[in-house]
Interface confidence: medium
């Protein structure tokens, strides 16, 4: 299996530093993947014009992202630790089918594709460690996410484009309500 | 462009470490494979550290084979208890060896002999 | 992770067609990450397909490259003397591992 990073791999940048606390580890993998995003948003962008299409909220009804809700504890009000925990971790893991839609979806940045997917594995396991209610965690049917996976793959072209386009703006909001909220724990 | 060295004669049993220096591109944009080849033989991948420094080596290359990013341009390649089997031509390669943007270094020769 | 290369061996005169067929133990990465490449002695190799069925930059449209999960094929349509060289498949597999199938030869008479 992989080795993530900040385990036995080495830090290059500074590699005199201090070991980097959980938190720390977690914050850094976060800004990682978001900068993993913006690099795959700016093909998509480049490629369609789906950042400026109005036809958005059409398709995203049809794909049921995970999203941040009040009642998840998550936002500054009513904020709840271990509630918000499990959201999280919850909605990377119902995040990961569409990851592995996103493998086959670029070109230029395939590379940057397959890092953010298992720059996420290595997050999700970070928080796990984290979590204490492990039981609250519900995992996605390996079946359920195969036939959605087909599904997304037998769409048409314009379909496909937009489908990109509408993973990356969630798991990048997702990203970001998550930061947030893991920097107030 | 990538480019291998470190490549020499060693005697069995000993180390070796081989760099591979990347031109034009840093190592934040694009991982890097290291694939061998014996004399007149196939080709055989073993490992590659991803731009999310994630390493993945072959089964048979884990425990003796260290795949290392050592600054923003360079890997190294990381051999121990070598024996004349390991003799081989070893490649440097940008990117996984499936991905489009692959490019391959000339190659620097290992010889385990005694 | 194994893939097979079919066949070891194959002579084509010019203008023939040739096909080389690469089988995986496994379903490769997301069924599609196999690529094709070509080398010729004293080379590094030199990518000609990838995703399957891609063709790379600056190689001729007479290489081609179908399948997908286990079974792969290479066709090179219109054998020319320049095709005569060793022929590798090469995945990926879940973790990102790799694999290089045993090598084709391929001889133009």
């Known amino acids: 299996a992989p080795v993530p990073p900040g385990e036995d791999s080495k830090d290059v940048a500074a590699p005199h530093r201090q070991p980097l606390t959980s938190s720390e580890r977690i914050d850094k993998q976060i800004r990682y993947i978001l900068d993993g995003i913006s690099a795959l948003r700016k093909e998509t962008c480049n490629k369609s014009n789906m950042c400026e299409s109005s036809k958005e909220a059409l398709a995203e009804n049809n794909l049921n992202l995970p999203k941040m809700a009040e009642k998840d504890g998550c936002f500054q009000s009513g904020f709840n630790e271990e509630t918000c925990l499990v959201k999280i971790i919850t909605g990377l893991l119902e995040f990961e089918v569409y990851l592995e839609y996103l493998q086959n979806r670029f070109e230029s940045s395939e590379e940057q594709a397959r890092a953010v997917q298992m720059s996420t594995k290595v997050l999700i396991q970070f928080l796990q460690k984290k979590a204490k209610n492990l039981d609250a965690i519900t995992t996605p049917d390996p079946t359920t996410n195969a036939s959605l996976l087909t599904k997304l793959q037998a769409q048409n072209q314009w379909l496909q484009d937009m489908t990109t386009h509408l993973i990356l703006r969630s798991f990048k909001e997702f990203l970001q309500s998550s930061l947030r909220a893991l920097r107030q724990m | 462009s990538v480019e291998e060295s470190g490549g020499r004669l060693v005697a069995p049993g000993g180390s070796l470490t081989l760099t591979c220096k990347a031109s034009?591109?840093?190592?934040?944009?694009?991982?890097v494979s290291w694939v061998r080849q014996a004399p007149g033989k196939g080709l055989e991948w073993i490992g590659y550290v991803s731009i999310a420094d994630t390493i993945s080596y072959a089964n048979w290359a884990k425990g003796r084979f260290t795949i290392s990013k050592t600054s923003s341009t360079t890997v190294d390649l990381e051999m121990t208890s070598l024996t004349t089997e390991d003799t081989a031509t070893y490649f440097c390669v940008r990117g996984f060896i499936t991905y489009s943007g692959v490019l391959w270094g000339p190659g620097t020769l290992v010889t385990v002999s005694s | 992770q194994v893939l097979t290369q079919t066949p070891a061996s194959v002579s084509a005169a010019v203008g023939g067609t040739v096909t080389i067929s690469c089988q995986s133990s496994q379903n490769v990465y997301s069924n599609a990450f196999l690529s094709w490449y070509q080398q010729k002695p004293g080379q590094p190799p030199k990518l000609l397909i990838y995703?399957?069925?891609k063709l790379a930059s600056g190689v001729p449209s007479r290489f081609s490259g179908s399948g997908s999960g286990t079974q792969f094929t290479l066709t090179i349509s219109g054998v020319q003397c320049d095709d005569a060289a060793t022929y590798y498949c090469?995945?990926?597999?879940?973790?990102?591992?790799?694999?290089f199938g045993g090598g084709t030869e391929v001889v133009v008479v």
């Open positions: 995703k399957a069925s």
């Open positions: 090469a995945g990926e597999y879940e973790g990102g591992i790799g694999t």
């Open positions: 034009g591109f840093s190592l934040s944009s694009s991982g």
